[in-house]
């Protein structure tokens, strides 16, 4: 009996046309959502003249669909036993899930005047893109409705620059109409261990943002892991919204609708500087923000992002340093509700229930060239949003799922 | 197309005052500041004065500060150079040239100017 | 001040001879260089920004190398039309500073 049923699952997970792992996983049969919330910051002024603590007040949630569309340019390796993929981005508002609407306003940093100065640290430019922050009547912070900045809006600073440039920023600018890969994956048809397993990203099997193996793409997406789970497994997949590979550790037994499954969880320690986890001294870039490598739980992916000062964290700095946290007020870290997890039915490895949490900070420093920057006394690492992206299984699909596998097994 | 063309230099005693002016086509002044550097009779280039886009901002080499004055009329897409109390060592070609990340894209011809009494 | 120091201040130099020039800043400067080619009676023309960026329209055999404080120009196989003055500036601080120049003349 248990022959047949490994037999059986090894045979469905198998990312090949026909399978029920293939199916599921060309289009989603989970619904996907997308919550953000809006760091609203109160003392735009204050912050501005006297580098005061910045005071925000969270507005949400703001909620998307997405995730909804099927996986494109599929094409199946049999030589490498790979199966390669783009996923197509798209976000749907989903108005009765949110606090208000898309032109909702808030007032956040101003992305374009805390970037500029950070990608050009030029005093003569500097002198120039000054003339162009005070032209435009450009500030520190800046009044955005939701859609403009999680979506993109015309830069009226950068409008000013005589170059051909890309002149719309936004938090996600360009999401819709883009595509996330190509990934490149082991469909597990000659080693069941190995499927779903990421062989390669845009074409290349390191991403060259980081030093050493910290550059690794490691593991699955996350959606899937190669089937026959155990706890003591740690389970590693690669995320391209914060650049990296990351590792969720076994932390309990769940009952989901039914079925029993294994979360997974984050630990503290994937975001723990260098002094506390030596693993991570290549996830460590610069020696200034971070006070020499011993500042926590903030990722600097400007490498990912074309230079720009773009931090990763948990919601509200939850496992960062009292360092980060420090210069922003209204902050309030909850492991249940800002941790990442990933609900993992071990038989088949599929992921049935998953939150992702992450922040969006800015790193935004003094530039004595620049008026709207030149009164800062201190660097802030500024959150703008944080969010939560979710899925579970669908009450269908579970008694399906109930019927066919961890009933065949009791 | 993108020129700049210089007119009024000539001959002027010291202590004396020139204007020079720098007329711009295919561009627009303002969107990207305008500099003057000068060249000694056979010597190397020396930058003399910029305006930054928009005209928010003057800046000045040491040796002409306070003497030297540049400035810009956006209607006739033209800047200047206001020179007074020249001195023998003014004495150069001026160029006016477009930036606007610090490096001169277009120059144009030049214009003498000679100090000498 | 930022001193932008050139060697050599000439040289002589044959058709077809690969030739390079050198500029030191008197402090970082990052890649924020730029290099000028002037001939007798003209204006400078721009070659090279941010170090090694060929502007366009220069032929492919100027090159730029360098970053922080020292930094070189090559031309790969000499031409009989680049017999020139070469000058180095930074566009890094204010004020703008050329080095003091590198006549190439013809051997």
């Known amino acids: 009996g248990d022959m047949l049923i490994e037999k059986t699952i090894k045979r469905e997970v198998v990312l090949e046309e026909g399978t029920t792992a293939f199916k599921n996983w060309v289009k989603t049969g989970t619904t996907v959502y997308r919550q953000f919330w809006i760091f609203d910051v109160q003392n735009p002024d204050d912050v501005a003249k006297n580098s005061s603590k910045i005071k925000v007040k969270q507005r949400g949630p703001y909620t998307y669909r997405v995730r909804y569309l099927a996986k494109e340019n599929i094409t199946q390796d049999p030589e490498d036993h790979t199966v390669s993929f783009v996923q197509p981005n798209g976000a749907i508002f989903e108005p009765s899930l949110s606090v208000g609407t898309e032109d909702d306003n808030f007032t956040v940093l101003n992305l374009a005047v805390a970037a500029a100065p950070h990608i050009y640290q030029n005093s003569f430019v500097q002198v120039v893109l000054n003339s162009l922050i005070k032209k435009s009547k450009s500030s520190m912070f800046q009044t955005r409705s939701l859609k403009e900045l999680l979506w993109g809006y015309k830069d009226p600073f950068l409008s000013l620059v005589p170059y051909p440039i890309s002149t719309t920023v936004g938090v996600f600018y360009p999401y819709n109409d883009t595509v996330d890969g190509v990934y490149k994956v082991f469909n597990g048809k000659d080693n069941i261990s190995k499927v779903a397993i990421i062989e390669s990203y845009k074409g290349k099997r390191n991403l060259s943002y980081w030093p050493s193996y910290c550059d690794m793409i490691n593991g699955t997406d996350a959606a899937s892991f190669p089937p026959f789970v155990e706890k003591s497994r740690t389970l590693r997949f690669f995320s391209s919204d914060i650049c990296r590979s990351i590792y969720a550790v076994f932390g309990s037994e769940i009952d989901l609708k039914g079925i029993p499954v294994y979360r997974f969880v984050l630990p503290a320690n994937a975001f723990a500087s260098p002094l506390q986890n030596p693993d991570n001294h290549c996830f460590c870039t610069e020696k200034v923000i971070s006070n020499n490598c011993t500042s926590y739980g903030v990722l600097d992916i400007g490498k990912c992002k074309e230079g720009k000062p773009v931090y990763i964290s948990l919601p509200h700095f939850l496992h960062a340093s009292p360092d980060v946290s420090e210069p922003i007020e209204g902050l309030h870290p909850n492991e249940d509700e800002h941790r990442t997890y990933l609900d993992v039915e071990p038989i088949t490895g599929f992921t049935l229930q998953f939150a992702k949490r992450l922040q969006v900070n800015i790193l935004v420093k003094p530039a004595r060239k620049i008026e709207a920057l030149k009164n800062l006394k201190r660097p802030y690492i500024v959150p703008i949003l944080w969010l939560n992206e979710t899925g579970t299984i669908g009450d269908e699909k579970a008694e399906m799922f109930k019927t066919q596998v961890t009933g065949k097994i009791k | 197309e993108v020129q700049l063309v210089e007119s009024g230099g000539g001959l002027v005693q010291p202590g004396g005052s020139l204007r020079l002016s720098c007329a711009a086509s295919?561009?627009?002044?303002?969107?990207?500041?305008i500099h003057w550097v000068r060249q000694a009779p056979g010597k190397g280039l020396e930058w003399v004065a910029w305006i930054a886009p928009y005209g928010g901002y003057t800046y000045y080499a040491d040796s002409v500060k306070g003497r030297f004055t540049i400035s810009a009329d956006t209607s006739k897409n033209t800047a200047y150079l206001q020179m007074n109390s020249l001195r023998a060592e003014d004495t150069a070609v001026y160029y006016c040239?477009?930036?606007?990340?610090?490096?001169?894209?277009?120059w144009g011809q030049g214009t003498l100017v000679t100090v000498s009494s | 001040d930022i001193q932008m120091t050139q060697s050599p201040s000439s040289l002589s130099a044959s058709v077809g001879d690969r030739v390079t020039i050198t500029c030191r800043a008197s402090q970082d400067v990052s890649n924020w260089v730029a290099w000028y080619q002037q001939k007798p009676g003209k204006a400078p023309k721009l070659l090279i920004s941010?170090?090694?960026s060929l502007y366009s329209g220069v032929p492919s055999r100027f090159s730029g190398s360098g970053s922080g404080t020292d930094f070189t120009l090559t031309i790969s196989s000499l031409q009989p039309e680049d017999f020139a003055t070469y000058y180095c500036?930074?566009?890094?601080?204010?004020?703008?500073?050329f080095g003091q120049g590198t006549k190439v003349e013809i051997k």
């Open positions: 040239a477009r930036s606007f990340f610090g490096y001169f894209d277009y």
């Open positions: 941010y170090a090694n």
């Open positions: 500036q930074q566009h890094s601080n204010l004020p703008l500073t």
């Open positions: 295919g561009f627009t002044i303002s969107s990207f500041g």
